[in-house]
Interface confidence: medium
């Protein structure tokens, strides 16, 4: 074991903001820390104060402009500190050369809606939020529906290999409520992991007609 | 996958110096963070400086402050920690690492050991 084992994770959105979590076993809960970044070849440094979010991590979000503004590009390196208060000074606790388009981790997709509903299937759409217009159409999407008597995690997972803001979810059960949740992933990056799960949108399927199915 | 090998290490006597090295072959070394470890007999193995790709170093531990120096040459794959006035408390295996960032292993990021260099201070 490494003493005072520590991880220091952080994601761009691919605009504006990156987000990091700092943790550090043994670490006093009163610490003052924050994430200071400083890109290589950009006139502006950002900081943001780590503030607890369990008993030995912290995180805060390095916001680097207005939400849809493109502030970092595919060769910007920032170099990323965590920085923590030890009396008088500041001491560099983590440091990383972070490259943002390896790093990447969207918003959650927004504004779902039920474009159409039948007995037995319901088409959804919704939006990617605050996106680069770098990847064009190199995004991916999972979706996952809620059933009456089941969790989130038993829901199997619907993949969408393309940009595609829209599924038809087909063989549902007449007269019955679902809910519906939708993430996105850029292609790009070594590092580039999943979005939040979106709000969940819950929907209700039409009942039967009385002597027939349609 | 990348390869971490660490000389330099020896025997010296208090307050004397020694020059480590860390020679990395494998994936684009200037992408890395690198740092030393060291492990002293019977005791945790404990964080000492990282330097990233663009030379960017944390700060070290107040026992070591003023004495350690941590460098990098991108052009030969290596990094190095000069030690002078060496104290017998230095006594230790020091390993070479290697990830995204250091002291850190990020989620779902590898750290890289070397296999380590004995240095041993005698009073």
């Known amino acids: 074991a490494v003493n005072g084992t520590s991880q220091f994770t952080c994601f761009y959105n691919s605009r504006a903001n990156i987000s990091c979590v700092w943790s550090q076993d043994g670490a006093l809960q009163d610490t003052s820390c924050q994430v200071h970044a400083w890109p290589d070849r950009r006139r502006w440094n950002q900081t943001c104060e780590l503030l607890p979010v369990s008993q030995a991590s912290w995180a805060c979000n390095l916001i680097l402009g207005a939400p849809d503004s493109q502030k970092l590009t595919t060769v910007d390196i920032v170099t990323l500190r965590v920085l923590c208060r030890e009396g008088v000074r500041w001491r560099v606790m983590a440091i990383q050369d972070f490259k943002p388009f390896e790093n990447l981790r969207l918003m959650a997709p927004i504004s779902l809606q039920v474009v159409h509903v039948e007995t037995h299937r319901c088409n959804i759409s919704w939006e990617i939020s605050q996106a680069s217009h770098y990847f064009e159409r190199h995004l991916e999407f999972e979706a996952r529906t809620l059933s009456p008597g089941h969790t989130w995690e038993e829901a199997p997972l619907l993949t969408l290999k393309q940009k595609q803001e829209w599924i038809c979810l087909e063989t549902l059960t007449p007269d019955t409520q679902y809910e519906f949740q939708v993430r996105v992933k850029p292609l790009q990056g070594e590092f580039t992991t999943w979005s939040p799960w979106s709000q969940p949108l819950a929907f209700r399927t039409k009942p039967a007609a009385l002597g027939k199915d349609t | 996958e990348v390869q971490l090998v660490e000389s330099g290490g020896g025997s010296v006597q208090a307050g004397g110096s020694l020059r480590l090295s860390c020679a990395a072959s494998?994936?684009?070394?200037?992408?890395?963070?690198m740092g030393w470890f060291r492990q002293a007999p019977g005791k945790e193995r404990e964080f000492v400086v990282a330097?990233?790709?663009?030379?960017?170093?944390?700060d070290m531990p107040d026992s070591v402050e003023g004495r350690f120096t941590i460098s990098r040459d991108n052009a030969k794959n290596t990094i190095y920690l000069d030690m002078k006035n060496l104290k017998p408390g230095d006594t230790a295996v020091y390993y070479c690492?290697?990830?995204?960032?250091?002291?850190?292993?990020?989620?779902?990021?590898?750290?890289?050991w070397g296999e380590g260099t004995l240095v041993t201070v005698s009073s």
């Open positions: 690492a290697s990830a995204r960032g250091l002291p850190v292993t990020p989620l779902g990021d590898i750290i890289y």
């Open positions: 494998g994936r684009t070394f200037s992408d890395y963070t």
């Open positions: 330097i990233t790709g663009t030379g960017h170093t944390t």
